[in-house]
Amino acid sequence: QEEDLPRPSISAEPGTVIPLGSHVTFVCRGPVGVQTFRLERESRSTYNDTEDVSQASPSESEARFRIDSVSEGNAGPYRCIYYKPPKWSEQSDYLELLVKETSGGPDSPDTEPGSSAGPTQRPSDNSHNEHAPASQGLKAEHLY
């Protein structure tokens, strides 16, 4: 029987609360054999593809998407999807990126280390199981 592709996971380093102007790296993970990872914003029309995939473990692939200098426009939800031939996976859960002012007032939250959104069971979404459109020309390591 055909195996369903496992949903990817997404995490952010150093966390999901990032000071303005600092860097953040989104890490997408999927099974062995992934050839493309895609990092999507809330709107599917804004995304970044990378074929710079590494083998995180004998059973896991990963790709990293770095934003060098975070701005307020980078705040919001992100999720991952991947292409393992011949299919695209479902999307990961959303991970919310929060951007805080560097003044660091008493109420501003600290950076959360190792924040991630792993796969959870939810209804199947097959809208990406065909070849998705080509990358929109954004650099793999630099989202915006």
Epitope: Q1, E2, P31, V32, Q35, E51, V53
Partner: antibody
């Protein structure tokens, strides 16, 4: 041990058709792999022809030059064929079958020893 | 259409030397590249996948690396058994196909 063996290579005349068969030993096709054909003309480099998905669907991938004249099919859980039509002298080559698996990020391994196809009048 | 251009062709080196073979891609296929070794009368043998990961049983004298669209295979401490032709290949299942480079022959002086 996992291995592949090709058969069906022959000497045929230009314009003829030929079907090559690849048989797997030690494994059966699965959703984690593709089965592929590659050819090598005498003294020349490797030329990828086509691959077919080992899972339930029959997704196929072809080199642009091979579309229309070559057909790749799974005929069982351990055999794949390559049908070739309108053969010309330029198709003279050793034809290899290879497995392309997710564990190797789709590098081709193993390969069969090859079967020789000669097109001559 | 993706084109993989291998250089140099051929290369001659002595036992114990280090040999470097390059594979220039016309498009960025990321890490989806493999290297093979082929000896006369034999099928190719997978050496490296994912541009730098050694295939099972391949000695660490073989090293793959990548910088942008340029991929490099380095063979150190060259042995007589390394005399062969080496091919790079895009392993990306997409519209550009699984193209091979033209091959680089390594001969032992």
């Amino acid at each position: 041990e996992q291995s592949l063996e090709e058969s069906g290579g022959d000497l045929v005349k230009p314009g003829a058709s030929l079907t090559l068969t690849c048989k797997a030993s030690g494994f059966s096709f699965s959703s984690s792999e593709f089965m592929c054909w590659v050819r090598q003309a005498p003294g020349k480099g490797l030329e990828w022809i086509a691959c077919i998905y080992g899972g339930l669907s029959d997704d196929t991938y072809f080199a642009s030059w091979a579309k229309g004249r070559f057909t790749i099919s799974k005929t069982s859980s351990i055999t794949v064929t390559l049908q070739m039509t309108s053969l010309t002298a330029a198709d003279t080559a050793t034809y290899f079958c290879a497995r392309s698996c997710d564990v190797n990020y789709y590098g081709f391994d193993p390969w069969g020893p090859g079967t020789l196809v000669t097109i001559s009048s | 259409e993706l084109v993989l251009t291998q250089t140099p062709a051929p290369v001659s080196a002595a036992v114990g030397d280090t040999v470097t073979i390059k594979c220039q891609a016309s498009q960025n296929k990321g890490t989806n590249l493999a290297w093979y070794q082929q000896k006369p009368g034999q099928p190719p043998k997978l050496l490296i996948y994912l541009s730098s990961t050694l295939a099972s049983g391949v000695p660490p004298r073989f090293k793959g690396s990548r910088s942008g669209t340029e991929y490099t295979l380095t063979i150190s401490d060259l042995e007589c058994a390394d005399a062969a032709t080496y091919f790079c290949q895009s392993t990306y299942y997409g519209s550009n196909g699984l193209t091979f480079g033209g091959g680089t022959e390594v001969e032992i002086k």
